[in-house]
């Protein structure tokens, strides 16, 4: 039910990369606001956004404190300008999300080629470890701490003037292949999850290769 | 749902080249590499090649001269190439749909006898 | 290339039987591991990949372990549906397969 001038919201969505996640929802409110409350399965409600004409929340500070834990939000519909108005049935319109739990759910981030370093027929190839705004000991953690050896990243290689590709595989954030010599690579990375269903795989990273900034040639 | 179905010849001569046809559907190629296996009778598994979601391709070290993989990606087709077939070449050919892990969805094979 | 090479080639069992399958690599491949099982005239099916990772739909009688270049297939109880030929593979380019072990009744 809910007051005569408010309306529940509605396709409420999570949106999140690498853990920092916000709660989108429609409609824009006209004549209205919004507050989003969070919580844990077994905890308490926590408001945020309080009174807000904006259609989405974020609530990576919240949801951080344990990515692993299954969270559910809900918005709240007050008249704009009377927000201690409740409906009918004594309380504020509102509408629940999905329930999200970020360690399984939160899309990985494009990754990024940090570096490569080619020794002879050998090329090591580093990739980026992002940070994260999951917090431990005051300290923030990358995404390699956050996963550990659930996350792994698949490299694609390829000679510049070839139609061929090949991959290789680590759970570390570094690969170390064999390239022949006097030939150009480019190189691109994907981060995946294999334990998941969905949400697996990130997009490809920018392609870098050989000749360019990043790479640093040593003939052995 | 997925499903990958392979056809072609089911007997091919010595010296003659093999197409075979792997058509996918449930998925795109755009969004999944695909390999070719096969598997001579009573034999293990051999890993044949792949073409990428970029069209790109690699090949087993040993069979790379007489392989060519491509795709119609407007048909949902994936095609294998090979030349020169000899009697050693009898297999069961499979295509399968890459999972980054591990190839979770299979085509039910296609038996592929050389003989003259 | 890094080629791999499964233990035995085949094996007899009881069903009830706790199995072990054994794969190693020529060279530590982090984990990127996978096993299937092939049943006569069918194609292979995925049941773990990445080392220890249970495919959707397989029964949780089987798991896998291992690390660098050594791995294990075990299957705890066995069933009568399980009677089979079980597969190693290893996903760097060229991808590779072990030679298979059989898995045949007592």
């Known amino acids: 039910s809910g007051t005569t001038n408010t309306v529940a919201a509605y396709n409420l969505t999570w949106k999140s990369t690498n853990f920092k996640t916000i709660l989108e929802w429609e409609p824009k409110p006209v004549n209205q606001v919004y507050t989003v409350q969070i919580s844990t399965k077994s905890g308490d409600w926590k408001s945020k956004c309080f009174y807000t004409t904006d259609t989405e929340c974020d609530l990576t500070d919240e949801i951080v404190k344990d990515v692993k834990q299954t969270y559910l939000a809900r918005v709240f519909s007050y008249p704009a300008g009377n927000v201690e108005s409740t409906g009918s049935a004594g309380e504020p319109l509102y509408e629940n999300s999905p329930e999200f739990t970020p360690y399984l759910e939160t899309n990985l981030g494009q990754p990024t080629i940090q570096s490569f370093e080619q020794v002879g027929t050998k090329v090591n190839v580093t990739v980026e470890d992002e940070r994260t705004l999951v917090r431990r000991n005051n300290t923030f953690l990358s995404l390699r701490d956050v996963f550990g050896k659930d996350l792994i990243y698949t490299l694609y290689y390829w000679k510049s003037s070839s139609s061929g590709k090949k991959t290789a595989k680590t759970n570390t954030n570094e690969f170390l292949i064999d390239v022949d010599k006097g030939e150009n690579y480019c190189f691109s990375v994907q981060a995946v999850i294999p334990s998941r269903t969905v949400n697996r795989k990130s997009t490809d990273s920018p392609v870098e290769c050989m000749g360019q900034e990043k790479g640093e040639f040593r003939e052995i | 749902q997925v499903q990958l179905k392979e056809s072609g010849p089911a007997l091919v001569k010595p010296t003659q080249t093999l197409t075979l046809t792997c058509t996918v559907s449930g998925f795109s190629l755009t969004n999944y590499n695909v390999h070719w296996i096969r598997q001579p009778p009573g034999k293990a598994l051999e890993w044949l090649g792949v073409i990428w979601t970029d069209g790109k391709t690699d090949y087993s070290t040993s069979l790379k001269t007489r392989l060519t993989i491509s795709r119609d990606t407007s048909k949902n087709q994936v095609v294998l190439t090979m030349t020169n077939m000899d009697p050693v070449d009898t297999a069961t050919y499979y295509c399968?749909?890459?999972?980054?892990?591990?190839?979770?969805?299979w085509g039910q094979g296609t038996l592929v006898t050389v003989s003259s | 290339d890094i080629q791999m090479t499964q233990s035995p080639s085949s094996l007899s069992a009881s069903v009830g039987d706790r199995v072990t399958i054994t794969c190693r690599a020529s060279q530590n491949i982090n984990n990127i591991l996978a096993w299937y099982q092939q049943k006569p005239g069918k194609a292979p099916k995925l049941l773990i990949h990445y080392t220890s990772s249970l495919q959707s739909g397989v029964p949780s009688r089987f798991s896998g372990s291992g690390s660098g270049t050594d791995f294990t297939l075990t299957i705890s109880s066995l069933q009568p549906e399980d009677f089979a030929t079980y597969y190693c593979q290893q996903a760097y380019t060229p991808y590779a397969f072990g030679q298979g072990t059989k898995v045949e009744i007592k």
């Open positions: 399968a749909r890459d999972w980054d892990t591990g190839f979770d969805y």
